[in-house]
Amino acid sequence: MMTGTIETTGNISAEKGGSIILQCHLSSTTAQVTQVNWEQQDQLLAICNADLGWHISPSFKDRVAPGPGLGLTLQSLTVNDTGEYFCIYHTYPDGTYTGRIFLEVLESSVAEHGARFQIP
């Protein structure tokens, strides 16, 4: 039975040209995290594998940095970066957990972080 929950940074906003950290955290399970995939809508951004380490998709290498931890840092943000991001936790023996983050990239200097929320 899958007992874990994914806590994410929820709905967040950031300034154009700035950077943002996307973070997910898996809790309430003793399952071993074997891999975390980060996706932006229909694009694979990066993978963090427990044995192989990080793989950043070449087309995002200039603007995506691994970490902190299992998180992902997006740099030099543009308005086109607005949208849904998913952290997909592959675990053993539980299976797959998915967290969702919505990022809005703003032209103005007013960019406040949203509250955290949980996805069971």
């Epitope: 071993q32 074997t34 891999q35 996706e39 229909d42 694009q43 694979l44 993978i47 594998n49 427990a50 044995d51 192989l52 793989h55 998709s57 087309s59 592959h90 053993y92 023996p93």
Partner: antibody, heavy 118, light 107 residues
């Protein structure tokens, strides 16, 4: 240099058994998921089975489920495919392939031919 | 199971031509789509992974695009060594599945 070398193919009668091996070298075998892919003569590629690097979880194509068993021995850097109840339609070249991140297959062996015929 | 449909099944082209092969998935597979090249009697060779990432050592005339259900492999200027069969493959879920292949022949 990454190398994958399959062996164990040959001629077998319908209903018979065969065990294929894939000897890996040039990389940390235990860190990678591995797959078996086959190709019938003149046909396309068909994934047969896969085994995860971490959990050892095994996955099979419907066409071989219950007849084939994938396994690995990380101490010997070797991948196996035990094939039972073989049928004529299992005739193919069998390739082992390395699967980093469970997303792609970047290195393939040269293949070993399995012929099931009476 | 996810079905992968490749088109065309074969094509004739000349050296220097721009060649496009398409692959369609029966459901969304995000960008979990790979392209392989196979020559007669040889093992498949990875060209493009995760829809658009060029595998190390593969010439830059090969490129991949697409996401969701529709994907494309493009060879910008066909070279003599590119005459082969090309396969797409999804890794979104098991069972992993391949397209039927596209044979690129000399015109």
């Amino acid at each position: 240099e990454v190398q994958l070398l399959e062996s164990g193919g040959g001629l077998v009668q319908p209903g018979g058994s065969l065990r294929l091996s894939c000897a890996a070298s040039g990389f940390t075998f235990s860190s990678y998921s591995m797959n078996w892919v086959r190709q019938a003569p003149g046909k396309g590629l068909e994934w047969v089975a896969g085994i995860k690097y971490s959990s050892g979880n095994k996955y099979y194509a419907d066409s071989v489920k219950g007849r084939f068993t994938i396994s690995r021995d990380n101490s010997k850097n070797t991948l196996y495919l035990q094939m039972n109840s073989l049928r004529a339609e299992d005739t193919a070249v069998y390739y082992c392939a390395r699967g980093p991140y469970d997303v792609w297959m970047d290195y393939w062996g040269q293949g070993t031919l399995v012929t099931v015929s009476s | 199971d996810i079905q992968m449909t490749q088109s065309p099944s074969s094509l004739s082209a000349s050296v220097g031509d721009r060649v496009t092969i398409t692959c369609r998935a029966s459901q969304s597979i995000s960008s979990y789509l790979n392209w392989y090249q196979q020559k007669p009697g040889k093992a498949p060779k990875l060209l493009i992974y995760a829809a658009s990432s060029l595998q190390s050592g593969v010439p830059s005339r090969f490129s991949g695009s697409g996401s969701g259900t529709d994907f494309t492999l493009t060879i910008s200027s066909l070279q003599p060594e590119d005459f082969a069969t090309y396969y797409c493959q999804q890794s979104y879920s098991t069972p992993l599945t391949f397209g039927g292949g596209t044979k690129v022949e000399i015109k």
